[in-house]
């Protein structure tokens, strides 16, 4: 048993038929020492007596919020909290595994630049008595310091019958240097209550690793005279790293007709314009990507040919 | 990268098409390494991460461009202590600093270069011939260095008598090669702010 | 010992809003993991949960029903309230408080109020 | 939302034999179903939650079982008292809902 924060605990238990679970003992936080009852859940019936308690968790009944009173007056709580391990594997029930870029990938996180702010996301399909908590470090051993903020409910989509809803939390690196070059990972730590399940989810990365820039600005296209070919020109997004020189892009210049099936056109370039044909009803994208690193591509900014 | 880019114009700063070269060189090489060690510790989430530069060389801070010189995180360990010639240096961009910065990026290559030959002359030795380092690679590093163009001592390769343990030596490959992507993309970055200013 | 009573009128007219009060006594919804939902049972037909309000505030409604439906609390008056707007005949039914615990079933009801929509 | 179907509608069992509900969500609620008794004229009463944790003060006769989708109420000794309605309700997600009921009587 551990405590989770002030009067929360959670009590890890093997999860099998008949498991003998786990002896806890409840210590009544009050000075007194007589005629002291508990009570479970604010139910009226009388577990037991004295300043201790000791019971044997074993299952979700034995979990839940016991109480300590003193002549109907409340002296103080403790919320019990379990935590399921089956055949050696802590349960993952409360988040979906998004499964991408590998099986059991319960958290993604996201970078717009080297600033050392990052976002990170999961999914579950629990709408109630749902609490999330998130810690992170950088390095374990001897963490150095990230802070994130509260996670928010940031999405909520239909997959056939299903909802399923996304929560997000951003993040930022106590003391970074964008130019610095990373040798400990990220650390990020997720606690997930959902009413007395307590599970946990880690995931670890380096920023270097989960940057995505946000698609090119200002996308402009002009027509070149006698000619069907169009200059596209366009900027570093507003929230890329600066200086540009340094923190540099590449690009990928698309031209789509308006068919899916119709073949598309790539160019890929260094420099912030680029020469192609516009055919009629096409539309021209463009995205970019850490010009020396090769993490992932941007969204595309798009514009119609017309 | 997989990825046509246009060459330099060959009136550019002229360590930038050699930077670009070694960081191609070096993303293949590992590249190499990940699939033909499938089954070693290879990938970024397994291997340690060690940089043999460490108290050796100061490149990031050397190299900071000048808009981060106000970021007191990339302020920390700022070395002064460097040869202040080369040739990479156009006479009108000669600064202290930024000889400082093209030195410490020379005496990365060396260490790297050092211990690169070394691990080949043990991968040689593998009955398994299972990989070899890219000589491509290798030549690269030898490239940047002479245009580069500091006077240093050679530092003789390190020769081992006892016979080598293959699968350690692997995983140091892998865990070298990772780094020294991680110090190219800096190099790169480096030049790339160098050529623009 | 805990106990919950609903109270509200009898008999609405279509188009009008109902209002009902849940009091309770035994616990309290001030600092504890509690809630109060509000369900109700058409005669001779199943149960349908309609709203609940936790102890922090956080409130949920039925879709189906949420435009119409507004739940608060006064915890200083161990009450909550459910006001229904634009009721209709087919809202004819008996409302019923129930307590949520922390084990998130319904463990105390009240006894149920029996509201008829009619004009 | 989630769908609970319970079958049978109507169940009549002899007294001292086994009774058993079921109950099937139209998606995992994994063990966030809760089963209730209900009397002619009486509020609902809370028996089992978490799917298989009998409630303070309920008869072991009563149990509960299932996960994800599946869920079964089962009564071992049909008594007279237990002459009711039975009801199953998730609240995995909202909104919470209740299965149309299983009206169970003696034989």
């Known amino acids: 048993i551990w405590e989770l924060k002030k009067d929360v605990y959670v009590v890890e238990l093997d999860w099998y038929p008949d498991a003998p679970g786990e002896m806890v003992v409840l210590t009544c936080d009050t000075p007194e020492e007589d005629g002291i009852t508990w009570t479970l859940d604010q139910s009226s019936e009388v577990l037991g007596s004295g300043k201790t308690l000791t019971i044997q968790v074993k299952e979700f009944g034995d979990a839940g919020q016991y109480t300590c009173h003193k002549g109907g007056e409340v002296l103080s709580h403790s919320l019990l909290l379990l935590h399921k391990k089956e055949d050696g594997i802590w349960s993952t029930d409360i988040l979906k595994d998004q499964k991408e870029p590998k099986n059991k990938t319960f958290l993604r996180c996201e970078a717009k630049n080297y600033s050392g702010r990052f976002t990170c996301w999961w999914l579950t399909t629990i709408s109630t008595d749902l609490t999330f908590s998130v810690k992170s470090s950088r390095g374990s051993s001897d963490p150095q310091g990230v802070t994130c903020g509260a996670a928010t409910l940031s999405a909520e989509r239909v997959r056939g019958d299903n909802k399923e809803y996304e929560y997000s939390v951003e993040c930022q690196e106590d003391s970074a240097c964008p130019a610095a070059e990373e040798s400990l990972p990220i650390e990020v730590m997720v606690d997930a209550v959902h009413k007395l399940k307590y599970e946990n989810y880690t995931s670890s990365f380096f920023i270097r690793d989960i940057i995505k820039p946000d698609p090119p600005k200002n996308l402009q296209l002009k027509p070149l005279k006698n000619s069907r070919q169009v200059e596209v020109s366009w900027e570093y997004p507003d929230t890329w790293s600066t200086p540009h020189s340094y923190f540099s892009l590449t690009f990928c210049v698309q031209v789509q007709g308006k068919s899916k099936r119709e073949k598309k056109d790539r160019v890929f370039t260094d420099k912030t314009s680029a020469t192609v044909i516009c055919r009629k009803n096409a539309s021209i994208s463009v995205r970019a990507q850490d010009r020396y690193y090769s993490s992932s591509w941007s969204e595309w900014a798009s514009v119609p040919c017309s | 990268r997989n990825l046509p880019v246009a060459t330099p114009d060959p009136g550019m700063f002229p360590c930038l098409h050699h930077s670009q070269n070694l960081l191609r060189a070096v993303s293949n090489m590992l590249q190499k390494a990940r699939q033909t060690l499938e089954f070693y510790p290879c990938t970024s989430e397994e291997i340690d991460h060690e940089d043999i530069t460490k108290d050796k060389t100061s490149t990031v801070e050397a190299c900071l461009p000048l808009e981060l010189t106000k970021n007191e995180s990339c302020l920390n360990s700022r070395e002064t202590s460097f040869i202040t010639n080369g040739s990479c240096l156009a006479s009108r961009k000669t600064s202290f600093m930024m000889a400082l910065c093209l030195s410490s990026i020379y005496e990365d290559l060396k260490m790297y270069q050092v211990e690169f030959k070394t691990m080949n002359a043990k991968l040689l030795m593998d009955p398994k011939r299972q990989i070899f380092l890219d000589q491509n690679m290798l030549a690269v590093i030898d490239e940047l260095m002479q245009a580069l163009n500091f006077n240093s001592e050679t530092v003789p390769q390190k020769s081992s008598l006892e016979e080598p343990d293959f699968y350690k030596t692997k995983i140091k490959l892998c865990i070298l090669l990772h780094a020294f992507r991680i110090r190219a993309v800096t190099i790169d970055r480096v030049m790339s702010y160098l050529n623009a200013s | 010992e805990v106990t919950l009573r609903e109270s509200g009128p009898a008999l609405v007219k279509p188009t009008q809003t109902l209002t009902l009060t849940c009091t309770f006594s035994?616990?309290?919804?001030?600092?504890?993991?509690?809630?109060v939902s509000w369900i109700r049972q058409p005669p001779g037909k199943a149960l349908e949960w309609l709203a609940h309000i936790y102890w922090d505030d956080d409130k949920y409604y039925n879709p189906s029903l949420k435009s119409r439906l507004t739940i608060s609390k006064d915890t200083s008056k161990n009450q909550v309230v459910l006001t229904m707007t634009n009721m209709d005949p087919v809202d004819t039914a008996t409302y019923y408080c129930?307590?949520?615990?922390?084990?998130?079933?319904?463990?105390?009801w009240g006894q149920g109020t029996t509201v008829t929509v009619s004009s | 939302d989630v769908v609970m179907t319970q079958s049978p509608d109507s169940l009549a069992v002899s007294l001292g034999e086994r009774a058993t509900i079921n109950c099937k969500a139209s998606q995992s609620v994994s063990n966030d179903v809760a089963w209730y008794q209900q009397k002619p004229g009486q509020p609902p009463k809370l028996l089992i939650y978490y799917a298989s944790n009998r409630y303070t003060g309920v008869p072991d006769r009563f149990s509960g079982s299932g996960y994800g989708t599946d869920f079964t109420l089962t009564i071992s000794s049909l008594q007279a008292e237990d002459v009711a309605v039975y009801y199953c309700?998730?609240?995995?997600?909202?909104?919470?809902?209740f299965g149309g009921g299983t009206k169970v009587e003696i034989k």
């Open positions: 309700q998730q609240d995995y997600n909202s909104p919470w809902t």
């Open positions: 129930t307590r949520r615990g922390i084990r998130s079933a319904m463990d105390y």
């Open positions: 035994g616990f309290s919804l001030s600092k504890s993991v509690m809630g």
